[in-house]
Amino acid sequence: MAVTACQGLGFVVSLIGIAGIIAATCMDQWSTQDLYNNPVTAVFNYQGLWRSCVRESSGFTECRGYFTLLGLPAMLQAVRALMIVGIVLGAIGLLVSIFALKCIRIGSMEDSAKANMTLTSGIMFIVSGLCAIAGVSVFANMLVTNFWMSTANMYTGMGGMVQTVQTRYTFGAALFVGWVAGGLTLIGGVMMCIACRGLAPEETNYKAVSYHASGHSVAYKPGGFKASTGFGSNTKNKKIYDGGARTEDEVQSYPSKHDYV
């Protein structure tokens, strides 16, 4: 029950996180005009990953897309790439995790397969969250650098008479949405990985049936495979048949949870 709850919660948290990553990526307010200690202008500038906008006091907002690809800063391209990778991984992760949910029955899917899929989606969510956090952090770092650079020469005087005000940009709402969303996706991914451990059964100990030969204490299997002495041998990834005499544990062979790490 706890496993199902953990898996379900992980899925929901990741879903919210990925929705947030998509929202942040589409938002126009990645950077907004810094209003502190600035002359009061009747125009408010803000920029996103895909376009820049200007909101006039009179009520008009005009947005212009970045129609160039080669002319854009490499850092902006990198942030775009990170966010898109995050969204794609997250979307695939969501798709995989839907089928992995313990509460959803799809044919005769084994718990081992569900555990495997849960782990896969969990890892995808973790990478997706990290991509979003990295993308937002790279953009934030870019803003901080540009902010202090523009502060250094905020007023570029022309003969001391005419002044040009340089627009400084600070963190926009999208950055905070991105950080929170990335964090949620990451947490959701961790929860899925934890749920995977509960879904996968404990390591199967295939109990060999001993055929005691006189004077030997070594268990033999038909087919020429030599089993290790005693019981509880780790038959990692090998299904050993005992010629029809098998214990209850061996009716179905489960992969070890460590096989998919």
């Epitope: 005009q33 002359p39 009061v40 202008t41 009747a42 125009v43 500038n45 803000y46 920029q47 820049s52 906008c53 200007v54 006039e56 006091s57 009179s58 009520g59 008009f60 005009e62 212009r64 005419v162 002044q163 040009t164 005000v165 340089q166 627009t167």
Partner: antibody
Amino acid sequence: QVQLKESGPGLVAPSETLSITCTVSGFSLTTYGVQWVRQPPGKGLEWLGAIWAGGNTNYNSALMSRLTISKDNSKSQVSLKMSSVTAADTAIYYCAKGGYGNAMDYWGQGTLVTVSS
Amino acid sequence: DIVMTQSPSSLAVSLGERATMNCKSSQSLLNSGNQKNYLTWYQQKPGQPPKLLIYWASTRESGVPDRFSGSGSGTDFTLTISSVQAEDLAVYYCQNDYFFPFTFGQGTKLEIK
């Protein structure tokens, strides 16, 4: 079509408060801002202030202490109040709608306010 | 506050001639976000309220004859009437629409020779 009409007292005694109402039609005050401009007889234009769609206001720094601009969206009315008036405040007062580039694209006909005892 | 200086204060031209008036601001009115200059030109005929001619320094308001054109960027702006008509007799004002408080120039009076 867009229309703005100012209505004022015409005559105000010195040190009193001047109150003018601008009634608009053809557009919504929740979408567009309204600006106020005055013109003393035979002189140039002077920007007084503005109230924007969101309700935020900006004022002429020289008159800020005496000016108050407010609006009633439901009545489509914007009001300008100026306290402690003097003869220097005698002017034609215009209200105008904010347009592209924060320019004033539609103007009222103006109302002449004379400050005299 | 931003100071707007218009020159000349009055201008006399013959009908059909070209009229050019200037406006200078104490600070750049260019917004880096959209590369637009927030300077507006108004025309005021005697006994009438002002009329919007040009916004964003060079964009003509709808219904304004194409003989009116605006140019300039940053701090220096020009209003040109390519062929002056009798109905163009008016005072022309430039306005800073970028920094609060918005400020007007003192006006240029266009007279017919």
